[in-house]
Interface confidence: low
Amino acid sequence: DGCNDIFMKNEMLSASQPFAFNCTFPPITSGEVSVTWYKNSSKIPVSKIIQSRIHQDETWILFLPMEWGDSGVYQCVIKGRDSCHRIHVNLTVFEKQWCDTSVKGLPNLSDEYKQILHLGKDDSLTCHLHFPKSCILGPIKWYKDCNEITGERFTVLETRLLVSNVSAEDRGNYACQVILTHSGKQYEVLNGITVSITERAGYGGSVPKIIYPKNNSIEVQLGTTLIVDCNITDTKDNTNLRCWRVNNTLVDDYYNESKRIREGVETHASFREYNLYTVNITFLEVKMEDYGLPFMCHAGVSAAYIMLQLPAPDFRAY
């Protein structure tokens, strides 16, 4: 059928909670393309009716919630004027009890993440939540070994749990819990995180602080030029690397052919106790596939993202 096949890594998912997967594969999706989702090589596309438990939402496939029978290979077909790519995603649904079934604790965990905290440092855990704009996420609650996290060393900041003065006792099983609202219905998302402790501080031994972005979204019109600064404070003697990434790839490499999105030249200002670094990302022209994609600013072990979103329609104009 003339489509190029691309195989993604398997996704292990927990039953009974929402899950979404975004079909973006730049530079394939960087032009005028149509995206259609299918299940198990079916000729019938996944429904686009938002009331359906499984439906396509723009470039996303959305499960509200995931169920046992949803395991399988899903294909997203990206058709351009002169190209066709078929991306295969293997989703495996499983039942996982995070707490003992005898203990009244948390519900089942979704995809388990592995994260590292640095001993003696101020560090953070991130609750990875990737859903389309139609899903509204509430504030996050954090748990360790089935108990809600308390104590003055812990601060919840949007999608992050800040941990000050990390100790060896901070290793273990964590979970972040959030209420997702979609079309008036509420669902619970619970992500498990296995946390290990390391004494080795990334690169230069300091943990940089990303002042901006703050895992926030930016409203931007399609087709416009956008420049976003990543502002980082770090010790004067640091050797940390600072860069912008998308899908775990340097933006300059990711958009190597089109050069539509580029990382800028790093600048810094020197203060008494620290340096303030700025490295920007430039979108020469914002395209549809940029929306909903986390563009990550990295600084040593720290990371924070911006996500572009279309402005809400201004009905007063009609």
Epitope: I136, L137, G138, P139, T150, E152, T155, V156, L157, E158, I179, T181, I211, K214, N216, S217, I218, E219
Partner: antibody, heavy 120, light 106 residues
Framework: QVQLQESGPGLVKPSQTLSLTCTVS??????GYWNWIRNHPGKGLEYI?????????YYNPSLKSRVTISRDTSKNQYYLKLSSVTAADTAVYYC??????????????WGQGTLVTVSS | DIQMTQSPSSLSASVGDRVTITCRAS?????MYWYQQKPGKAPKLWIY???NLASGVPSRFSGSGSGTSYTLTISSLQPEDFATYYC?????????FGQGTKLEIK
């Protein structure tokens, strides 16, 4: 420096809808919690609700059936609407937010407050 | 709802006095927040996460407590400290304030 400024009519008739705007400068409402609180004359503070950076809203159950908090990120403003007002809704209304130097919960930045009187 | 009860409701004291304001919650709360409010002004965050002083708050102020009982203490009262103080909990919604303690000059 983060600044918040409430605006809206100071007088609202009973049974009508109270509408207030909070204009934010020095911070983006696409981060953090953006709260409304009121202070009844001679009484204490009452928490009304918030809109979260994601658009999620929380309302105090005692007001939930009458209150709506919304936002316009392009204007960096968020809004309070309180319907079917009575004299008991006469109060100074404040918008407030936390700050990254603190925890998001802590209401560090406040507007100066706007007095809304419900009277015919 | 968690009820927050401050005591005393009002307090007359002299400059130099040591003053303690208590806030009791009807259920356990993780942290307490304290605000200072002067007439015609917006409240100011005074103490956060039970014992942390907000920016610009003098060191004569301190906060302590856990569970259902929390206190704000002024070690040596100064003229600018006369105001109303509110406690607040963010542990369980709805997020409730105490009724306030009015600190007046004797």
């Amino acid at each position: 420096q983060v600044q918040l400024q409430e605006s809206g009519p100071g007088l609202v008739k009973p049974s009508q809808t109270l509408s207030l705007t909070c204009t934010v400068s020095g911070a983006s409402i696409t981060s953090g919690y953006w709260n409304w609180i009121r202070n009844h004359p001679g009484k204490g503070l009452e928490y009304i609700g918030y809109i979260y950076y994601s658009g999620y809203t929380y309302y105090n159950p005692s007001l939930k059936s009458r209150v709506t908090i919304s936002r316009d990120t392009s204007k960096n403003q968020y809004y309070l609407k309180l319907s079917s007002v009575t004299a008991a809704d006469t109060a100074v209304y404040y918008c407030a937010t936390g700050g990254y130097d603190y925890v998001e919960d802590a209401l560090y930045y406040w507007g100066q407050g706007t007095l809304v009187t419900v009277s015919s | 709802d968690i009820q927050m009860t401050q005591s005393p409701s009002s307090l007359s004291a002299s400059v130099g006095d040591r003053v303690t304001i208590t806030c009791r919650a009807s259920s356990n709360v993780r942290y307490m927040y304290w605000y200072q409010q002067k007439p015609g002004k917006a409240p100011k965050l005074w103490i956060y996460l039970t014992s942390n002083l907000a920016s610009g708050v003098p060191s004569r102020f301190s906060g302590s407590g856990s569970g259902t009982s929390y206190t704000l203490t002024i070690s040596s009262l100064q003229p600018e400290d006369f105001a109303t103080y509110y406690c607040q909990q963010f542990t369980t919604s709805p997020y409730t304030f105490g009724q306030g303690t009015k600190l007046e000059i004797k």
